[in-house]
């Protein structure tokens, strides 16, 4: 799977995490910080 950083167009997309662009899947993906979950790392669960 080809991975790169998300474009500046997606700034602010991942609230508490790192935005990764999964090129082959045509998807942006949020890698959440510890304690956060949700598609956009918007939920704190600890």
């Amino acid at each position: 799977v080809s991975i790169t950083k998300c474009s500046s167009d997606m700034n602010g997309y991942c609230l508490h995490g790192q935005c990764i662009y999964l090129v082959d899947m045509s998807q942006n993906y949020c890698r959440c910080e510890v304690g956060y979950t949700g598609v956009r790392c918007e939920h704190f669960f600890l």
Epitope: S7, S8, M10, G12, N28, V39
Partner: antibody, heavy 116, light 106 residues
Framework: EDQLQQSGAELVKPGASVKLSCTAS????????IQWVKLRPEQGLEWIGR????????KYVPKFQGKATITADTSSNTAYLQLSSLTSEDTAVYYC?????????WGQGTTLTVSS | DIQMTQSPSSLSASLGGKVTITCKAS??????IAWYQHKPGKGPRLLIQ???TLQPGIPSRFSGSGSGRDYSFSISNLEPEDIATYYC????????FGGGTKLEIK
Amino acid sequence: EDQLQQSGAELVKPGASVKLSCTASGFNIKDTYIQWVKLRPEQGLEWIGRIDPLNGNTKYVPKFQGKATITADTSSNTAYLQLSSLTSEDTAVYYCVRSGTLFDFWGQGTTLTVSS
Amino acid sequence: DIQMTQSPSSLSASLGGKVTITCKASQDIHKYIAWYQHKPGKGPRLLIQYTSTLQPGIPSRFSGSGSGRDYSFSISNLEPEDIATYYCLQYDNLRTFGGGTKLEIK
């Protein structure tokens, strides 16, 4: 199956306003950005702006600032494009487009005709 | 705002031939460019994203390349169904479409 269902065709008089809707099914709009795009056959595709439904933040192309207002209602999973002070230049097909979890998933488009 | 200059605005080519369309960005867009096909009465169809990544179901006759400010899109072995208008889209910083290229068959 993910879908973006746009409202039906509109015939509106010059000077009036119109509000177009884009209702998502199969996914939560809060997980995405919703973009709006204008298509006129001779002028081509133009990006109008976008909204982040999670917080309501919007971005517009300067050309459409004051002409277009993008809003979202997360309770109904719907995004809106309001166009004001309509002229013949606003006659076009308007598309809502989802980006974020999936690259650029388009609605079917709404035809807006401005005519007296 | 990033501007996208697409050329040519129209072109005519023979069946079985090859055409190339270019888009030049007003600044480096870091390969964040997509290419769309549009036919009258239909919605735009995504062909390629991230410069060269073909979407599922898109024939390998379509290809893209480039970096920095300069990008190109090619169709080889032209077929009648390729008659359409093609647009580039930068999505590095917000979004901007190119002006479009209308493709006709000789």
